[in-house]
Each structure stands twice: as C-alpha cells, then as structure tokens.
C-alpha cells in the first residue's frame, strides 16, 4: 500500500522539514530559511512564528517545528499556543477594561490572573467561618457550631470581615 500510495502521490514521500516542490517536478525540497514543515507530505512550508513585542521566544523555530512564544514578565499567556498576552494584576485584584481593580468585598483572587471569585459560604455546608476571607484569600471554614460541644474549643465565630482602608471606587 505504501508503495502504491507513493507511486500515486510522490509528495507523500517528502519528510518533515521539506515540501513537495511543484516548481521542481514534485521533488522534495528542504524548507527555506525561517520556515518549517512539522509533518511529511506538505506542499508548502509554513512561515515561522516571530515572538515580538510583549511576546518572547520560549523555543526557537526549526525546519521541522514552529517557534513557541510566551509573555514578558508582567504578562501571562491566553489562548491556544499563547496567542495573546494579558497584563498581570496583583493578588487581590482582577483585570478590567480600566486596568487592575481591587476585588470587591466578599470576593478574592489568589492569582495574578483571572477574576475575583466569591468567598466560600461556609453556612451552606453547615460550617462556620474559622478564618476570615480577604481580597487575596478565601475564607477557611471550620467545624459546624453543632460539632463543638460546650468547653471543647475556644474558637468563637469571628465578626464579619472588613477590609481596612477599602473605600468605594
């Protein structure tokens, strides 16, 4: 079958790093500079991706594989193959159209990317708040009040969390 296929289509014999050159009677030609083919049987070589601006080169292009980019410090990758770079924010913030904004009260973000998420509602699991939440950290839920027999623990439910110095935007 392989022999039959190659007789029908000489291009199928062209390995990665080459292309089937119609200008040369369909013989395999190596990819020209700054281009690649990652699979055999290609009729063209693809132009290497260039990592410019906010992108930086993670892996150089070769004749058989494309370049791979990541983002310069202060940015992180988004999309398949790092097709975009998005600005980092601090923990406790999220990126909006107007830039990085602090998480609203009752929400947190423990990463430099992504959105602020609501604190866990301990009471939904019948538990109590053991450690208050902050802009950067979720609350820590403790045992339910019913689990605490009198005198078994000195833990008292904390007062509702307030964030010092957090005024409306």
């Amino acid at each position: 079958f392989e022999r039959t296929r190659s007789l029908q289509d000489p291009c199928s014999n062209c390995p990665a790093g080459t292309f089937c050159d119609n200008n040369r009677n369909q013989i395999c030609s190596p990819c020209p500079p700054n281009s690649f083919s990652s699979a055999g049987g290609q009729r063209t070589c693809d132009i290497c991706r260039q990592c410019k601006g906010v992108f930086r080169t993670r892996k150089e292009c070769s004749s058989t594989s494309n370049a791979e980019c990541d983002c310069t410090p202060g940015f992180h990758c988004l999309g398949a193959g790092c097709s975009m770079c998005e600005q980092d924010c601090k923990q406790g913030q999220e990126l909006t159209k107007k830039g990085c904004k602090d998480c609203c009260f009752g929400t947190f973000n423990d990463q430099k990317r992504g959105i602020c998420r609501p604190w866990t509602n301990c009471s939904l699991d019948g538990k109590s708040v053991l450690v208050n939440g902050t802009k950067e950290r979720d609350v820590v839920c403790g045992p339910s009040p019913a689990d605490l027999s009198p005198g078994a623990s000195s833990v008292t439910p904390p007062a509702p969390a307030r964030e010092p110095g957090h005024s409306p935007q």
Epitope: G17, P30, C31, P32, P33, N34, C61, S62, S63, T64
Partner: nanobody
C-alpha cells in the same frame, strides 16, 4: 555567478565507501540550505541528505545510518560521506543550494 561543483564519485564495490564533495563559489551558505540529491536512470530525482537552515542534518530513510552530510563554511564545501554502499545507491548525485545545482557526479556500486 554562483557555481556548485561536485567531485568524489566513482566505481565502488558493495559495502564500500565514498566521500562526495561540493565546492561552491559565491556567498550562498549563509542564506541557503545545503542538500544532496540523487537520480538513478529512469527514476525521479530524490532528496538524500540536507543541512537545514537551522544547521540540523537530515536524512532520507534510505540514507539513515549509512550517509553523513557535513559542511565546511570556511571552504564553502558540503560533503556526503557514504558508507556501506549498496547496489541500489547507484545514481548520479547532485549538490543543491537554494536555486543552484551542480552538474552531478556519478556513483556506481557494482561487484
């Protein structure tokens, strides 16, 4: 004008070795790939070995483990060391760089 001139071909017995050379005139190594092709009578010209633009050597399946391509940029010369030659390696061998071709050198493997 750029010229590629091959040498080193000849008659050799099966299992023997030959070293082909391809000398270039003109500054082409910095911008082009270096490749060796071969063409047996009545057959299509086929790519045997090449040094890609990223300076990595590649080989056709028929050449792997037996042939070695190398390049000396100071001498503007590309080499093809051919070991363990077989009857089916008999062909005219052509040097190529970009759009430029040599005139070919004949390799005949015969007992």
């Amino acid at each position: 004008a750029v010229q590629l001139v091959e040498s080193g071909g000849g008659l050799v017995q099966p299992g023997g070795s030959l070293r082909l050379s391809c000398a270039a005139s003109g500054n082409i190594f910095s911008i082009h790939v270096s490749a060796w092709y071969r063409q047996a009578p009545g057959k299509q010209r086929e790519l045997v070995a090449w040094i890609a633009w990223d300076n990595v050597a590649h080989y056709a399946d028929s050449a792997k483990g037996r042939f070695t391509i190398s390049r000396d940029n100071t001498k503007k010369t590309t080499y093809l060391q051919m070991n363990s030659l077989k009857l089916e390696d008999t062909a005219a061998y052509y040097c190529n760089s970009g759009d430029f071709w040599g005139q070919g050198t004949q390799v005949t493997v015969s007992s």
